[in-house]
């Protein structure tokens, strides 16, 4: 807490400008009006304030808005956002995607902090669902964002938003998350033709059931081994040797290199040796 002291004569701030960097902490507290600061927040980022000076500015805003900052101030917080705690952010009501983008820009290049996680949570809850524009924005800043959500949170993602998802956004998703996302993707891409559909659905297939894999095996999709290795064990095990051969096409030879790894290992154990021998790969059940 900065002590309440009178502002020295002639030092009362008329606007937020470079001259304030020479003010001591107590002078900033005494001489900068909180309402002026709130209306000129956009100028703060252009001024090289020290961390200690930013603490004073934050303190002034906290006093002015004890129930939480208005969005007009939040949008222009800039580097002052890094001074906010998750508790501060929980008081906010952020509705504009532009505000969200502005604050994410401040944290760009860093891992998702608790502050950013809280901000995103407040924003998404305020919107009621994870719409396409929001998902586009969040995955652009944090490619792993989607996989940081619980299956319950993912259930609020509308199928239309799935179009915004890139393969790399799913890299760290676990099977339970893909179980939720796959049916949405199937719905989103249902009107595409065979080859285009497979390109889009491929990265979601870790959530696909056996019957969908069987259907794909009839479409000459030539699934690569990396995708096959991410399929659910319970979805792969019922597939016949012929179905796996059709599903993988020319990539079937890759099974040999993966024979010690799941789910290939479990699938091999399930097959009759005579059937495995038809592949000519030397796989032993």
């Amino acid at each position: 807490e900065v002590e309440k002291t009178a502002c020295p004569s002639g030092k009362k701030a008329r606007e937020i400008d470079e001259s304030l960097i020479f003010y001591k902490k107590w002078e900033l507290e005494a001489c900068v009006d909180a309402a002026l600061l709130a209306t000129q927040m956009d100028r703060v980022n252009a001024i090289p304030f020290t961390y200690e000076q930013l603490d004073v500015l934050k303190h002034k805003l906290d006093e002015l808005y004890p129930q939480g900052y208005p969005e007009s101030v939040i949008q222009h917080l800039g580097y002052l956002f890094l001074k906010m705690s998750p508790e501060d952010i929980r008081k906010w009501n952020v509705t504009s995607l532009e505000t969200l983008k502005a604050l994410l820009e401040v944290n760009k290049g860093h891992e998702m902090s608790p502050q950013v996680a809280t901000l995103i949570d407040r924003f998404v809850k305020g919107r009621g669902q994870l719409d396409k524009d929001t998902l586009d924005t969040l995955t652009a800043f944090y490619p792993g964002y989607l996989c940081s959500l619980s299956p319950e949170e993912l259930s609020s993602v509308p199928p239309s938003s799935i179009w915004a998802v890139r393969p790399q956004d799913l890299d760290t998703c676990d099977p339970r998350q893909l179980d939720v996302l796959y049916p949405k993707a199937r719905l989103a891409f249902q009107n595409m033709n065979g080859s285009e559909y497979f390109v889009k659905i491929q990265s979601f297939l870790g959530g696909a059931p056996t019957e969908d894999l069987k259907a794909l095996s009839q479409q000459n999709v030539s699934m690569d081994l990396a995708t096959f290795m991410k399929l659910r064990t319970d979805a792969v095990l019922p597939l016949t040797v012929a179905e796996v051969q059709k599903l993988l096409g020319p990539h079937v030879e890759g099974l040999k290199a993966e024979e010690r790894h799941r789910p290939v290992r479990d699938w091999i154990l399930r097959q009759r040796q005579d059937d495995l021998d038809t592949l000519g790969l030397g796989l032993q059940g």
Epitope: D174, P175, R176, M229, K230, T233, D234, L237, R260, H261, R262, R265, D266, L269, R270, Q284, G285
Partner: antibody, heavy 119, light 107 residues
Framework: QVQLQESGPGLVKPSETLSLTCTVS??????????WSWIRQPPGKGLEWIGY???????NYNPSLKSRVTISVDTSKNQFSLKLSSVTAADTAVYYC???????????WGQGTMVTVSS | DIQMTQSPSSLSASVGDRVTITCRAS??????LNWYQQKPGKAPKLLIY???SLQSGVPSRFSGSGSGTDFTLTISSLQPEDFATYYC?????????FGGGTKVEIK
Amino acid sequence: QVQLQESGPGLVKPSETLSLTCTVSGGSVSSRDDLWSWIRQPPGKGLEWIGYIYYSGSTNYNPSLKSRVTISVDTSKNQFSLKLSSVTAADTAVYYCARDNVFTGFDIWGQGTMVTVSS
Amino acid sequence: DIQMTQSPSSLSASVGDRVTITCRASQSISSYLNWYQQKPGKAPKLLIYAASSLQSGVPSRFSGSGSGTDFTLTISSLQPEDFATYYCQQSYDASYTFGGGTKVEIK
């Protein structure tokens, strides 16, 4: 529900063969969804997987023990067994048998049996 | 062999604490990672399978996350019965391997 019970001698002499049997009750060793494993734990140390067997007789062993280990299955008796040859004091441990369900993991364990290697 | 490295090897915590244990694989194991709890003189008990799925009968305060090489077991609010040793285990490669264990002790 499925239960596992280890049996075998608690004391084995150095250079001899350690033999243990695991009896499966309440379920079948011929289940297509399960592998049957042996795992051991030396006193005060961590867990070490020894190997598994599938009902078909297909096996897989820990590379560090492979030359000394044999796991077999007897579907008629609903049992699987472990043989570890040329034992030394370093093989002294609690030996567990466990079911490895392909969809989950080692979801059912025996209570473990302490085997001491000493002359 | 795939090496599994757990950290910390031991930790002291109080009832009600949030506890996090990490497990790192020497190469990608997809989501084929299980967590076990073991109490002295008892066989291990499966808590989490496939990195994040809660085994039937296990309290919801236990949760798992991760994929690839980095995994986490979290106990949201430590209970007296949770003081034990925890092990991670990979089943991706046919040569199964366990982590070295993390002993959770009372502070």
